[in-house]
C-alpha cells in the first residue's frame, strides 16, 4: 500500500495543522490514522494522536520550534504504510518564522 502523503496546511505560534491523502482504493481498508509527533532533538518522548479523518491540528506546541511529524495508516490487520518523517515549524512570536 502507498504511504500517506502529508502536507502542512497552516500553523500558528503554538499549533500545526496537518493533512494527508492516500489513493481512494486504499481508503476503505484504513480504520484510523495515527499521527506521531515530537520536538526535533527530543528523541526521548513523543506524542500520538489518532483520528478517522484526513487532518489534525496539533496544539499546545512551543513557538518557533521544529516538530517531527509522521502519519501511519491503521488497518484492521494492523499497521499499514507510514509516511515520511516530516519537519514542520511553528511560527515565532514575532510572526517571522522562515
Amino acid at each position: 500500500t502507498e504511504p500517506p502523503k502529508v502536507r502542512l496546511e497552516g500553523r500558528s505560534t503554538t499549533s500545526l495543522s496537518v493533512s494527508w491523502s492516500i489513493p481512494p482504493p486504499q481508503q476503505s481498508r484504513v480504520w484510523k490514522y495515527e499521527v506521531t509527533y515530537r520536538k526535533k532533538g527530543d528523541s526521548n518522548s513523543y506524542n500520538v494522536r489518532r483520528t478517522e479523518g484526513f487532518s489534525v491540528t496539533l496544539d499546545d506546541l512551543a513557538p518557533d520550534t521544529t516538530y517531527l511529524v509522521q502519519v501511519q495508516a491503521l488497518t484492521q490487520e494492523g499497521q499499514g504504510a507510514g509516511s515520511k518523517v516530516h519537519e514542520f515549524q511553528t511560527l515565532s512570536p514575532e510572526g517571522s518564522g522562515n
Epitope: 502542512l8 532533538g41 515520511k84 518523517v85 514542520f88 518564522g97 522562515n98
Partner: antibody, heavy 130, light 108 residues
Framework: QVQLQQWGAGLLKPSETLSLTCAVY????????WSWIRQPPGKGLEWIGE??????????NYNPSLKSRVTISVDTSKNQFSLKLSSVTAADTAVYYC?????????????????????WGQGTMVTVAS | SYVLTQPPSVSVAPGQTARITCGGN??????VHWYQQKPGQAPVLVVY???DRPSGIPERFSGSNSGNTATLTISRVEAGDEADYYC???????????FGGGTKLTVL
Amino acid sequence: QVQLQQWGAGLLKPSETLSLTCAVYGGSFSGYYWSWIRQPPGKGLEWIGEINHRGSINYNNYNPSLKSRVTISVDTSKNQFSLKLSSVTAADTAVYYCAKPLRPHCINGVCYSGDAFDIWGQGTMVTVAS
Amino acid sequence: SYVLTQPPSVSVAPGQTARITCGGNNIGYKNVHWYQQKPGQAPVLVVYDDSDRPSGIPERFSGSNSGNTATLTISRVEAGDEADYYCQVWDHSSDHVVFGGGTKLTVL
C-alpha cells in the same frame, strides 16, 4: 547560479589546526545550512558539520565523531563560512568540500534537515604529515 | 548511529540497466539523495527526495525508496556513467547527515 570557492592550507603537521574558508557567490546566504564534508583518499564521503545564521544567532550541528575538535563559523558580511579542525592527525588527511543544500532550511514552515547538496566547492586536499 | 549499506561495486554492459541499492533500517521513512562522483571531481547530485532529478540530469537516472532499501536505477547505461555513487539521508535520531559507503559502477 550559486558558486562556492574554498581555500586554506593544504599541508599540516600533526597536532596543528586545519583551517578552511568557503565563499558563496551569486546567491542568498541566509536561511541555508552550509556544510563541510570530507573524503579521505580512496574512501567515501564523511559529513563534518553545518552552520545556519538566522537573526543574530548561529546554529551549529556537528558529526558526533568529530564534535570535540570541530568549529564552523560564519562571516555574513562576506558571505563566507569557515571550518577549523584542531589536533589533526594523519587520519584527517582528506579532500575537504564545502557544500550548499538544495533548499533553504525552512520554507513556510516546512523544513529540510539533511537536504540534498546541489552545489559543492572545488575541494581542498589537506595532507597531515610530520 | 544510522548506517547506510551499499554494495562496493556493480558492473553492467553498455545499454543495459544498472541498479544500485542503499540499505538502511526503515529507510522508506526518509528522503534519500544520490550523488555521482568521477575521479578527481566533486560529487554531483543526480537524484533527490528519493526520485526527483535536478535540472540537467538525464531521465535515464531514476530512484525509488521503500521499506529498508532505496534504489538508484540508471537505464541505457553509457560509458560516461562509470563513477562512484553515494546515497545520503538525514538521521533524525542523531540529527546529522549520513552517507552510504559508495558503489563503484563499472561499465563493461
